[in-house]
């Protein structure tokens, strides 16, 4: 039973409205039917779990309602989203896969995607 | 499947010593973060020390100068030895493997470093006296 790799993109910039979306692979070693997909951030020295689903494979992604992630999985590949960002939401985003069933259990941890998020300027009010 | 076991636990007067092993079986011993955490009641488990692949270690402040984690990879076991200990090492020690190296030298000044750790022991009790 070996680590089973996990490969994000280093870097990726929200957009002016906050949303931030990257693709989250993993190499399966087995024919698992059932994979739990966590995200966490790192910052400023503490690890928070952003959000988290479990999925039957060839099945949609289901987060919880009030969940701020969405995502969809395709084969070995989850294109998560992260909605509501503002600037001090930027951090190291790290995807966590695990393989949950058929036994044996897999775990792996991609190297983090740094999503960097900046606040839109405010418009100006205007004098018309 | 991955297994932990750690034994080596007891109780001891403060100043004493003791060593904490873990057994490990069922993946490559060799290509994790491994590491020893504790954790009291109603606190959140926080890395103790942590030993990567090529051998560097990395220790929390309040252990330095104090206890030493090594492994030997011929016998896929994982030791802390703990000296010196003081009444607040009274706590409940586990090991723990992660899947990247990436995060084990940090995970000793991060909290909710376990998130970073999937496979666990069962836990040994360390009790300190004064």
């Known amino acids: 039973c070996k680590a089973m790799h996990v490969a994000q993109p280093a870097v990726v910039l929200a957009s002016s409205r906050g949303i931030a979306s990257f693709v989250c692979e993993y190499a399966s070693p087995g024919k698992a039917t059932e994979v739990r997909v966590t995200v966490l951030r790192q910052a400023d020295s503490q690890v928070t779990e952003v959000c988290a689903a479990t999925y039957m494979m060839g099945n949609e992604l289901t987060f919880l309602d009030d969940s701020i992630c969405t995502g969809t999985s395709s084969g070995n590949q989850v294109n998560l989203t992260i909605q509501g960002l503002r600037a001090m939401d930027t951090g190291l985003y790290i995807c966590k896969v695990e393989l949950m069933y058929p036994p044996p259990y897999y775990l792996g941890i991609g190297n983090g995607t740094q999503i960097y998020v900046i606040d839109p300027e405010p418009c100006p009010d205007s004098d018309f | 499947q991955v297994h932990l076991m750690e034994s080596g636990g007891g109780s001891v007067q403060a100043g004493g010593s003791l060593r904490l092993s873990c057994a490990a079986s069922?993946?490559?011993?060799?290509?994790?973060?491994l590491g020893w955490f504790r954790q009291t009641p109603g606190k959140e488990r926080e890395a103790v020390a942590t030993?990567?692949?090529?051998?560097?270690?990395s220790y929390a402040d309040s252990v330095k100068g104090r206890f030493t984690i090594s492994n030997d990879n011929a016998k896929n076991t994982l030791y802390l030895q703990m000296n010196i200990l003081k009444p607040e090492d009274t706590a409940m020690y586990y090991c723990?493997?992660?899947?990247?190296?990436?995060?084990?030298?940090?995970?000793?000044?991060?909290?909710?470093?376990?998130?970073?750790?999937?496979?666990w022991g069962q836990g040994t009790q360390v009790t300190v006296s004064s």
């Open positions: 030993i990567d692949i090529d051998g560097s270690t």
């Open positions: 069922g993946y490559t011993y060799s290509r994790y973060c």
């Open positions: 723990a493997a992660g899947p990247n190296p990436r995060y084990c030298s940090g995970a000793v000044y991060t909290r909710g470093a376990e998130h970073y750790f999937g496979y």
